[in-house]
Amino acid sequence: SGTTNTVAAYNLTWKSTNFKTILEWEPKPVNQVYTVQISTKSGDWKSKCFYTTDTECDLTDEIVKDVKQTYLARVFSYPAGNVESTGSAGEPLYENSPEFTPYLETNLGQPTIQSFEQVGTKVNVTVEDERTLVRRNNTFLSLRDVFGKDLIYTLYYWKSSSSGKKTAKTNTNEFLIDVDKGENYCFSVQAVIPSRTVNRKSTDSPVECMGQEKGEFRE
């Protein structure tokens, strides 16, 4: 259906990490342009990325208004020189996206180990609380602010001389672990939302090892 010189968008895909959310689609336009609309299940449609030749649209500003809502987007196709033109049914061609619930589906970004400090046989490892684009009272919320106790971190730690990785977990951003005195350890963290069934884990943080800059040692 639709006009002979436009094709409907397809492969509409949500790409979202720490709530930065972009809708992508195909095909690359030939003599056509796109406009995107987004809505919650019960809300009104809002237009974004008007008459664009891009095949992506940043919808972050819309979804961060309520990350627990479920959103639907649609991509309209128009002839490049005649955006008023409509399909055979009297309206432009469009394709719907899959539904998207940011709180349940946004990918967890790669965490960063902010610091570690050794005091005797204890090491305190701190994970950076990454800022998101979700706002409350004009301030950007951190990942922990948004997810609360739903978000946990797994720490993998190992002696530099060994391969076996011990684990520790926290629902804050800090770990306090026991280590052997005189041994150097390496650390990596992973963000996890255990209540999820998909997109449960982030990729691992870069590995940080004792004896490098981020660490501090006190007897």
């Epitope: 977990k169 992973q190 069934t197």
Partner: antibody, heavy 120, light 107 residues
Framework: EVQLVESGGGLVQPGGSLRLSCAAS????????IHWVRQAPGKGLEWVGY????????YHADSVKGRFTISADTSKNTAYLQMNSLRAEDTAVYYC?????????????WGQGTLVTVSS | DIQMTQSPSSLSASVGDRVTITCRAS??????VAWYQQKPGKAPKLLIY???FLYSGVPSRFSGSRSGTDFTLTISSLQPEDFATYYC?????????FGQGTKVEIK
């Protein structure tokens, strides 16, 4: 439905090798941690080791270190326990279990177990 | 490694009895303790996690509590299907460790 199915057990001579498989369905193993636990006849539960299939990280119990190796193939949604240099004391039912990776990390689903007998 | 000392190793009880099993951790494990039930020839089943939270589908006669490094599993009114072996487990640190088990038998 979440399911774990172990296979590969059997009778093996001391010093021999065996590879156990743990096939998962109803969930993706890369989102969880998979543990191996064993139980000698009439005895309690003994933890053998774990793998995080998302990064390949493992840890093995001292009793099996250097002899057993845990691995995973995420494309097959399966974890493995490679057992070498087997001893009579390795005779047990071997279970794989899923760790939900919450703060308390209970093993929320277990396989039915596969029996490994090491005997000449 | 953290030791989990479970007691008693076995007990005899009747249907309707209140049954208590305890586990003592050799060091602080916070609330990272789970309890499992195992019947002969079967895999263990999760009953309690985070020391006191009832796992989905587990009858409310099962409960768990913590006092420092002491953990308790209570069955408020023993049912015929509850005759089994029970294990505690800590997963506060690697390696996770199990208690020796408590066999609950019919008196």
């Amino acid at each position: 439905e979440v399911q774990l199915v172990e296979s590969g057990g059997g009778l093996v001579q001391p010093g021999g090798s065996l590879r156990l498989s743990c096939a998962a369905s109803g969930f993706t193993i890369s989102g969880y941690i998979i543990h191996w636990v064993r139980q000698a006849p009439g005895k309690g539960l003994e933890w053998v080791g774990y793998i995080d299939p998302s990064n390949g990280y493992t840890y093995h119990a001292d009793s099996v270190k250097g002899r057993f190796t845990i691995s995973a193939d995420t494309s097959k949604n399966t974890a493995y326990l490679q057992m070498n240099s087997l001893r009579a004391e390795d005779t047990a039912v071997y279970y794989c279990a899923r760790d939900d990776q919450s703060v308390s990390s209970p093993f929320d689903y277990w396989g039915q177990g596969t029996l490994v007998t090491v005997s000449s | 490694d953290i030791q989990m000392t479970q007691s008693p190793s076995s007990l005899s009880a009747s249907v309707g009895d209140r049954v208590t099993i305890t586990c003592r951790a050799s060091q602080d494990v916070n609330t990272a303790v789970a309890w499992y039930q195992q019947k002969p020839g079967k895999a263990p089943k999760l009953l309690i996690y985070s020391a006191s939270f009832l796992y989905s589908g587990v009858p409310s006669r099962f409960s768990g509590s913590r006092s420092g490094t002491d953990f308790t599993l209570t069955i408020s009114s023993l049912q015929p299907e509850d005759f089994a072996t029970y294990y505690c487990q800590q997963h506060y640190t690697t390696p996770p460790t199990f208690g020796q088990g408590t066999k609950v038998e019919i008196k």
